[in-house]
Structures are given as structure tokens and as C-alpha cells.
Interface confidence: low
């Protein structure tokens, strides 16, 4: 339904606390570079305005598109061409062409020291002092680094922040209490932000219907017990919700989160039993609950796949009447039967059905051609499988830094172009995926495993395309979405690439490593053997393990020395010297 | 269908005990967190305490910080509270609620401390 003011509309339907706190991620996330002071003040501008449209929606201006009135705040920003270069250009637009401007000048890697947390006792004075500045500095510093950040779920993280707080600066130890809550959230809302900025890719990249495919399979997976009718509806109502979120429509994007979560609470029975229990929780909690409620019980009695999309004599006929409802059918059908396949990996094959039925329903006898097409299907889900049980094998028997270790060896051979500081970033993200995936239960592993890797693979890809340095990275960047992981899978060593030469102050440490916190040695560790991947791009596993060795044996012994100066600087030019000899 | 029902409540006096009992069926109540809270004559609900699934973890509102504890028994599909130097302001309707909602559904078990 329209409304004379959606301002007014909005600002009623979140109340004010959510409003705020969208305005600030929205605008946090169009111009990255602002201080939180300068976001809060036009925050108020606009909250204030919103009040007044709520008083009398005929006011004056009230009755403007949200990009507008945005947008008009935005241009109004002194200094805008000193502080953001060409990004001011935007703002000789006219809408829609002025928002679709301001999101191409989205920066995914904005020149942003890293978001240092405070000590303890610091956080608790300014938390007490004023809670919902601090939380909007929270929102500010993540909504600023994660551009695309899914903006209701950052309100929920920025509850979770606020929950620990409350509890955590009462206690004695508040450190020991902060830290292990506070390191999950973070871990937790980083896996969020790509998974999300993978969603909008799809959508910028491949548009709506890439993304209905995707949340077809997983709602499918989820819900196996609900019909298509209902599958197709979810997933419409999902796409419209990250639709407006990647597109910064944020007031649309939670009202309709917020909208679409009631209307699952209001139709469980349709849906899944498993509902219950996030229905019960507040607005931000069951949102987030939802999104990730287990998968229902399959249904016992289902038909083998075949059935319907191979034995059926009309399958041709069913295919060219309606062809996106009937392999909308085939991946929910085949999605709901195996919760234990990756989204990916479903979506591999409904191509893979799709490009067969193209094919077969073509030729003389069509049954005859696409009747081995479930079997086609085997190969496409043993290379995942075997992908899984590899790493993770890996994994067990090298620990989370050693199995990122080895990743960094193998991607920095595949694409010894790119950054050191980008492959050591992937690596160790994508080395995270054995404590994240490989613990679960055999039946939970393969999605867990490809659909992150994807995700973080998507980052890797538009890191690259500001700088692209690497025709191999291009090549599987180039594709699409799903094959992405596959095509990284199968890369070898880069032939054409001519190794760096060696600089002894690439290897060069001093004493100050030492004081370092072990993230940051196991950085400076990595960097160093990306180094010397790219150096050497054909040492073997064992010559590296080797200089690592030595390496960690080094810092080992200088960390511990009376005068570690000393140390650095006489035993430093020594592992320079076994490192080169090692690797010669 | 979801089913938490509490008991043990009653009339007291200041600096007395109770232990309140939830039992849960419907749901496998061993896979949730659980929490208490209480709803005082006029007031919103007031989150008291909450457990995690396995039990290991628990938390406590300031308020009643060392004088109530939580348990639960997974076999037993039960959720405990322990009320030790009850106070008046303690006197509230006390429900137990699946995760860290504040949202009831359930009947509750009233508390009253009173001389």
C-alpha cells in the first residue's frame, strides 16, 4: 500500500531506536571515511525531519523517496570532492542514478586501520557513561569496514555486544568475562558479513533469479516439510529482503526481515516445526534465529527423484511449458532430499539438468538421452566430497595454523601475482573452515565446508577485480558464482610466472615481534612463507616445513634472549643465509 | 506442541527458600538454553537467569546475584531454580522461557514474600 510519507511510514514501523540505528549504518556504509561524530549529527537531522513527517506527513518534503532525502544529506557533506575524490560526481546525479552511483563507489577493502577493541575497563567506563553512543560507535566502525554488512543482522550483533556488556562490566574479572563473549560475536559477525556480501554479488552479478535459485535450495534443505507453493513464496519475500539491503535500502529491507519473520511465526504448520522457539524471542533474536534454524525432519515416505523428472514420459512437455517452475520443482525436490549437500553443489546440478534437458529435449528420442542424467550427477558430487574429506583430514592432523599454512602454500602457487597481505587474509580464512566445518557431524560437513569456502573465495574475487594481477584468479572470478570454488579446486602452479628475486629484509625481523600478540606473530610467520612460496613456487612441502621450522625455532630462541636486539640482528642474517641454502 | 510448565511457588517470608521447577516437553529441551524470569504486579517482565544447553554456563541479573542459582537435569526435561534470602521485591510471577526470551508461554508459579 502507498503511503503520502515513507519516511513517516518507516520511522513508525521500526520505532525510533531501529531507525537510528539504520540511518547510521546507511550512511556508514555509503561514505566510509566519515567520522562517527559527523554520521551521528546527520543521523539527528534526519530522525528529527522523520518526527516531524510523523507529526504532519503533508510537511514539507515529507512526501520525498528515501534515496532522495538521503542522498540530499549525503551531497551536503562540506568537503565531500576533498575527502572522497570522484565519489562527489555522484551527487550531480539525478535518482535513481545518484544511489546506483553512491554503491558503485562502495569500497570492500576501505583503507581503515583495523577495529582495535578497547581494554576492559575502558569499555565499561564509556558503556556505562553512555550506552548508545557507544553502541553506535559499534555500529559506525563495522557498518564502515563491511560495507554490504546485512544491516538488521548488525543491529542484532550490536544487541548481542550490548547483553555482554551489561553483564560482563559487573563482574570483577571483567576481561575474563569480555574476551571469550566478545571474540565470539566478532568471529561470528565476520562469517555473516561475507556470506551476506556473496549474496549481493549474486544479485549484482547474476541478478534476482540467481538469487531465488539459491534460496530456493537452502529453504528447501530447511523446511523439506513444506510444499513448493511455500518454498516459492519464502524465498520471493527472502529476495526481496536482501534485494533492498544490498541495494542500501535499509528502512525497506528490515521492515520487511521483520515482516517476513512474522509471517513465518504465524505459519508454522505449513513451514516446520522447528520454528517454535525463535518465534518466542524478540524481533532481532527470532529474525537471527530463523535465518539459522536447524533443518526439519525429512519426510519419510518421499519418491525417488526420478520419478518425476526422469521416468515421467512428459517431462519434455512439462520442461518447455513452464521451464523456470519446473526446474524450480527439480531443485526443490532434489534440495529438500539432501540437507547434506552444499547449496553450491545443488545448484551444480540443477545447471547440470538444465543444460541436459536443453540438449536431450532437442533429439529424436529424448527419454534415451537424458536418462542417465542422475548418474551424470555422480562425479559433480564426489569431487566436493572428496574435497571434504582431503581438508579435513588436513586439517586434523596439521591444527587450524598449520592446515592455514598449507592453503597458503597451495593458493600462493596458484596465484603468486596477488598481495602477500591478500593471500596471507584469505588463507587464514579459508584455514578456518576445519574449526568451523570438519567437527561437525559427517552429514553437516560438505555444506558447511563449500558454501564458506565460496563465500570467502567471492572476497578473494573482489579483492582482485580492484587490482587484477592474476590471469588464473580472473579466469574462475570470471565464471559463475557456483563453479567459482570448483575452478579455484582444480588450479595448479602458475607456469607462467617468474619468481621474485630474494631480499634479505623481506626476512628481516627485530625484537619487537616478540611483544606481539600471537595473531599477529602467526601474520608476520605467513607473510614471510607466502614470501618464500613466491620466491620458490616449486619448493617442495618438505623444504618449506624445513625453513619454518628454523623460522619458529628463531624467534623462539631471540624472544627468550637477555638482549634480543642482539639476537635479531647476529643470528637474523644466519636464518637469511640456511633459508636461502635450504631452498636452493 | 511446545509445553513449559512451573511450579513450586507460594507464600514465604523474608529471608526464606523455594525451589521452582520447570518441566519441559515438545521440543528436545536438552538442545536449548533455558532462562527464569519474573513479572512483578504492574510491571514488564525482568529477565532473572539463564542456563545454557548443557548446563555448564549460567547467568544472573544483578539483582538476585548470589542468593538464587540455576540448574536443569536434560534426563528429567526439568528446569530448577533455587531461591535462598528472599526478599520482598522478589514477589513476582515466575515463568521459565526457552532460550533468553522475555516473551511467555507459559502460566508461570507465583512467588510471594511477605511477613
Known amino acids: 500500500e502507498a503511503h503520502k510519507s515513507e519516511i513517516a511510514h518507516r520511522y513508525n514501523d521500526l520505532g525510533e531506536q531501529h531507525f537510528k540505528g539504520l540511518v547510521l549504518i546507511a550512511f556508514s556504509q555509503y561514505l566510509q571515511k566519515c567520522s562517527y561524530d559527523e554520521h551521528a549529527k546527520l543521523v539527528q537531522e534526519v530522525t528529527d525531519f522523520a518526527k516531524t513527517c510523523v507529526a504532519d506527513e503533508s510537511a514539507a518534503n515529507c512526501d520525498k523517496s528515501l534515496h532522495t532525502l538521503f542522498g540530499d544529506k549525503l551531497c551536503a557533506i562540506p568537503n565531500l570532492r576533498e575527502n572522497y575524490g570522484e565519489l562527489a560526481d555522484c551527487c550531480t546525479k539525478q535518482e535513481p542514478e545518484r544511489n546506483e552511483c553512491f554503491l558503485q563507489h562502495k569500497d570492500d577493502n576501505p583503507s581503515l586501520p583495523p577495529f582495535e577493541r578497547p581494554e576492559a575497563e575502558a569499555m565499561c567506563t564509556s558503556f556505562k557513561e553512555n550506552p548508545t553512543t557507544f553502541m553506535g560507535h559499534y555500529l559506525h566502525e563495522v557498518a564502515r569496514r563491511h560495507p554490504y554488512f546485512y544491516a538488521p543482522e548488525l543491529l542484532y550483533y550490536a544487541e548481542q555486544y550490548n547483553e555482554i556488556l551489561t553483564q560482563c562490566c559487573a563482574e570483577a574479572d571483567k576481561e575474563s568475562c569480555l574476551t571469550p563473549k566478545l571474540d565470539g560475536v566478532k568471529e561470528k559477525a565476520l562469517v555473516s558479513s561475507v556470506r551476506q556480501r556473496m549474496k549481493c554479488s549474486s544479485m549484482q552479478k547474476f541478478g534476482e533469479r540467481a538469487f531465488k535459485a539459491w534460496a530456493v535450495a537452502r529453504l528447501s534443505q530447511t523446511f523439506p516439510n513444506a510444499d513448493f507453493a511455500e518454498i516459492t513464496k519464502l524465498a520471493t519475500d527472502l529476495t526481496k529482503v536482501n534485494k533492498e539491503c544490498c541495494h542500501g535500502d535499509l528502512l525497506e529491507c528490515a521492515d520487511d526481515r521483520a515482516e517476513l519473520a512474522k509471517y513465518m511465526c504465524e505459519n508454522q504448520a505449513t513451514i516446520s516445526s522447528k520454528l517454535q522457539t525463535c518465534c518466542d524471542k524478540p524481533l532481532l533474536k527470532k529474525a537471527h534465529c530463523l535465518s539459522e534454524v536447524e533443518h526439519d525432519t525429512m519426510p519419510a515416505d518421499l519418491p525417488a527423484i526420478a520419478a518425476d523428472f526422469v521416468e515421467d514420459q512428459e517431462v519434455c512437455k512439462n520442461y518447455a511449458e513452464a521451464k523456470d517452475v519446473f526446474l524450480g520443482t527439480f531443485l526443490y525436490e532434489y534440495s529438500r532430499r539432501h540437507p547434506d549437500y552444499s547449496v553450491s553443489l545443488l545448484l551444480r546440478l540443477a545447471k547440470k539438468y538444465e543444460a541436459t534437458l536443453e540438449k536431450c529435449c532437442a533429439e529424436a528420442n529424448p527419454p534415451a538421452c537424458y536418462g542417465t542424467v542422475l548418474a551424470e550427477f555422480q562425479p559433480l558430487v564426489e569431487e566436493p566430497k572428496n574435497l571434504v574429506k582431503t581438508n579435513c583430514d588436513l586439517y586434523e592432523k596439521l591444527g587450524e595454523y598449520g592446515f592455514q599454512n598449507a592453503i597458503l602454500v597451495r593458493y600462493t602457487q596458484k596465484a603468486p601475482q596477488v598481495s602477500t597481505p591478500t593471500l596471507v587474509e584469505a588463507a587464514r580464512n579459508l584455514g578456518r573452515v576445519g574449526t568451523k566445518c570438519c567437527t561437525l557431524p559427517e552429514d553437516q560437513r560438505l555444506p558447511c565446508v563449500e558454501d564458506y569456502l565460496s563465500a570467502i573465495l567471492n572476497r578473494v574475487c573482489l579483492l582482485h577485480e580492484k587490482t587484477p594481477v592474476s590471469e588464473h584468479v580472473t579466469k574462475c572470478c570470471s565464471g559463475s558464482l557456483v563453479e567459482r570454488r570448483p575452478c579455484f579446486s582444480a588450479l595448479t602452479v602458475d607456469e607462467t610466472y617468474v619468481p621474485k628475486e630474494f631480499k634479505a629484509e623481506t626476512f628481516t625481523f627485530h625484537s619487537d615481534i616478540c611483544t606481539l600478540p600471537e595473531k599477529e606473530k602467526q601474520i608476520k610467520k605467513q607473510t614471510a612463507l607466502a614470501e618464500l612460496v613466491k620466491h620458490k613456487p616449486k619448493a617442495t612441502a618438505e623444504q618449506l616445513k624445513t625453513v619454518m621450522d628454523d623460522f619458529a625455532q628463531f624467534l623462539d630462541t631471540c624472544c627468550k634472549a637477555a638482549d634480543k636486539d642482539t639476537c635479531f640482528s647476529t643470528e637474523g642474517p644466519n636464518l637469511v643465509t640456511r633459508c636461502k641454502d635450504a631452498l636452493a | 506442541q511446545v509445553q513449559l510448565v512451573e511450579s513450586g511457588g507460594g507464600l514465604v517470608q523474608p529471608g526464606g527458600s523455594l525451589r521452582l521447577s520447570c518441566a519441559a516437553s515438545?521440543?528436545?529441551?536438552?538442545?536449548?538454553?533455558m532462562s527464569w524470569v519474573r513479572q512483578a504486579p504492574g510491571k514488564g517482565p525482568e529477565w532473572v537467569s539463564a542456563?545454557?544447553?548443557?548446563?555448564?554456563?549460567?547467568r544472573y541479573a544483578e539483582s538476585i546475584k548470589g542468593r538464587f542459582t540455576i540448574s536443569r537435569d536434560n534426563a528429567k526435561k526439568t528446569l530448577y531454580l533455587q531461591m535462598n534470602s528472599l526478599k520482598p521485591e522478589d514477589t513476582a510471577v515466575y515463568y521459565c522461557?526457552?532460550?533468553?526470551?522475555?516473551?511467555?508461554g507459559s502460566q508461570g508459579t507465583q512467588v510471594t514474600v511477605s511477613s
Open positions: 522461557t526457552i532460550g533468553q526470551s522475555t516473551s511467555r
Open positions: 515438545g521440543f528436545t529441551f536438552g538442545s536449548f538454553g
Open positions: 542456563i545454557d544447553s548443557g548446563g555448564t554456563d549460567t
